[in-house]
């Protein structure tokens, strides 16, 4: 807290300019009018204030706007945004995507801070849903943003927004998140033809059910092993050897290198060894010839 002292003669700030870098904290407090600061916030970002000086400027704005800053000030905060606490940000009503972009730019290249997370939360809640433009903006700054949302939060993403999602945006998503996103992606891309559809849907397939994988196997899609390894184990297990062969196309040879890893390992255990042998890859661990396969899950359901 800066002590209240009178502004020395001749030091009253008539505008926000670089001469203020020479002011002490108490001089900024005494000589800079808060209303002047608010109307010339766009200049602050171009002036090399110290963090100590920024503390004073923030304090002046806090006094002027105890209920929270207006958007006209927020959009010009620049690096003063780094001084804001999540509690400060919760008082804001940010509706403009341009304001959001301006503040995200300040934090660019850094991890998502609690301030940024609060800002995004306030913005998205204010909009009611994660629309395409917002998602475009957020994933441009934070490729992992989508995967930081809970399945419940993801449920508010409209299918139209899925067009903004890039493969790298889904890199850190877990199966529960992909379970929510996949049906939206399927809906978003439903009018595309086979090969184009597969290119778009590929990143979301970690949430695909067995029947969709079976359908894809009929379309000569040549899924790569990296995508196959991200599929839900429970969706892969019911696939036949023939279906997997069609699904992977020339990439089927990669199964050998992955035979000890899920879901390939678990899938091999469910296949007849005879069928696996038809691939000519030397995959071992299938059900030996003459053994009866009981579907215990079906038996439990009947009892």
């Amino acid at each position: 807290e800066v002590e209240k002292t009178a502004c020395p003669s001749g030091k009253k700030a008539r505008e926000i300019d670089e001469s203020l870098i020479f002011y002490k904290k108490w001089e900024l407090e005494a000589c800079v009018d808060a209303a002047l600061l608010a109307t010339q916030m766009d200049r602050v970002n171009a002036i090399p204030f110290t963090y100590e000086q920024l503390d004073v400027l923030k304090h002046k704005l806090d006094e002027l706007y105890p209920q929270g800053y207006p958007e006209s000030v927020i959009q010009h905060l620049g690096y003063l945004f780094l001084k804001m606490s999540p509690e400060d940000i919760r008082k804001w009503n940010v509706t403009s995507l341009e304001t959001l972009k301006a503040l995200l730019e300040v934090n660019k290249g850094h991890e998502m801070s609690p301030q940024v997370a609060t800002l995004i939360d306030r913005f998205v809640k204010g909009r009611g849903q994660l629309d395409k433009d917002t998602l475009d903006t957020l994933t441009a700054f934070y490729p992992g943003y989508l995967c930081s949302l809970s399945p419940e939060e993801l449920s508010s993403v409209p299918p139209s927004s899925i067009w903004a999602v890039r493969p790298q945006d889904l890199d850190t998503c877990d199966p529960r998140q992909l379970d929510v996103l996949y049906p939206k992606a399927r809906l978003a891309f439903q009018n595309m033809n086979g090969s184009e559809y597969f290119v778009k849907i590929q990143s979301f397939l970690g949430g695909a059910p067995t029947e969709d994988l079976k359908a894809l196997s009929q379309q000569n899609v040549s899924m790569d092993l990296a995508t196959f390894m991200k599929l839900r184990t429970d969706a892969v297990l019911p696939l036949t050897v023939a279906e997997v062969q069609k699904l992977l196309g020339p990439h089927v040879e990669g199964l050998k290198a992955e035979e000890r890893h899920r879901p390939v390992r678990d899938w091999i255990l469910r296949q007849r060894q005879d069928d696996l042998d038809t691939l000519g890859l030397g995959l071992q661990g299938g059900i030996p010839n003459g053994y009866l396969v009981l579907d215990l899950s079906m038996q439990e359901a009947l009892s």
Partner: antibody
């Protein structure tokens, strides 16, 4: 280790302009952490602050000298300079350049060795 | 402009003595005060800033205190290399101003 070195004529005629340059070595004048200043000390008298400059070119002068003084910076040469116009014998002094860390309770932490300037015809 | 007045203007002391120098500001300057040491023909050297913070590399026998208008520089046990002139300087507001010095001489 940052060092400062003043240079310029040791003798200036009355009514002319005194020009001095301070060369910064061992560090960059373009650091956002420092101001750079000039201070003088007339023989047997008190130290007097002349002014400060930031690498961006923004400057701040002693009101008693403001009408006659100009401090400038040349980041490409890692130098800052002092010009004092219309000099009189009262401007005879040892002139020091110094570094001032940016902070609320700052003080000149590194000084040049000083250069004696005599104003005389 | 803030005036800085030092006292005494000079003093004589012996090695091992405790020496106290005072500096008074013409108005309150909180703790925006620095102390410098200058030996004949040499450059001023920063000893203390923010009234009581010892500059890196300065011996701990030097200490500063005070706030507002009255400040003190103390040398707890005077050493031969401490005979010099000491200046205070306020950085509360520009123009920065210096005291006119206290010369510490050998008794």
């Amino acid at each position: 280790q940052v060092q400062l070195q003043e240079s310029g004529p040791g003798l200036v005629k009355p009514s002319e302009t005194l020009s001095l340059t301070c060369t910064v070595s061992g560090g960059s004048i373009s650091s956002s952490s420092y101001f750079w200043g000039w201070i003088r000390q007339p023989p047997g008298k008190c130290l007097e602050w002349i002014g400060n400059i930031y690498y961006s070119g923004s400057s701040n002068y002693n009101p008693s000298l403001k009408s006659r003084v100009t401090i400038s910076v040349d980041t490409s040469k890692n130098q800052f300079s002092l010009k004092l116009s219309s000099v009189t014998a009262a401007d005879t002094a040892v002139y020091y350049c110094a570094r001032l860390p940016r902070g609320d309770r700052d003080a000149f932490d590194i000084w040049g060795q000083g250069t004696m300037v005599t104003v005389s015809s | 402009e803030i005036q800085m007045t030092q006292s005494p203007s000079s003093l004589s002391a012996s090695v091992g003595d405790r020496v106290t120098i005072t500096c008074r500001a013409s108005q309150g300057i909180s703790n925006y005060l620095a102390w410098y040491q200058q030996k004949p023909g040499k450059v001023p050297k920063l000893l203390i800033y923010a009234a009581s913070t010892l500059q890196s590399g300065v011996p701990s026998r030097f200490s500063g205190s005070g706030s507002g208008t009255d400040f003190t520089l103390t040398i707890s046990s005077l050493q031969p290399e401490d005979f010099a002139t000491y200046y205070c300087q306020q950085s509360y507001s520009t123009p920065f101003t210096f005291g006119c010095g206290t010369k510490v001489e050998i008794k």
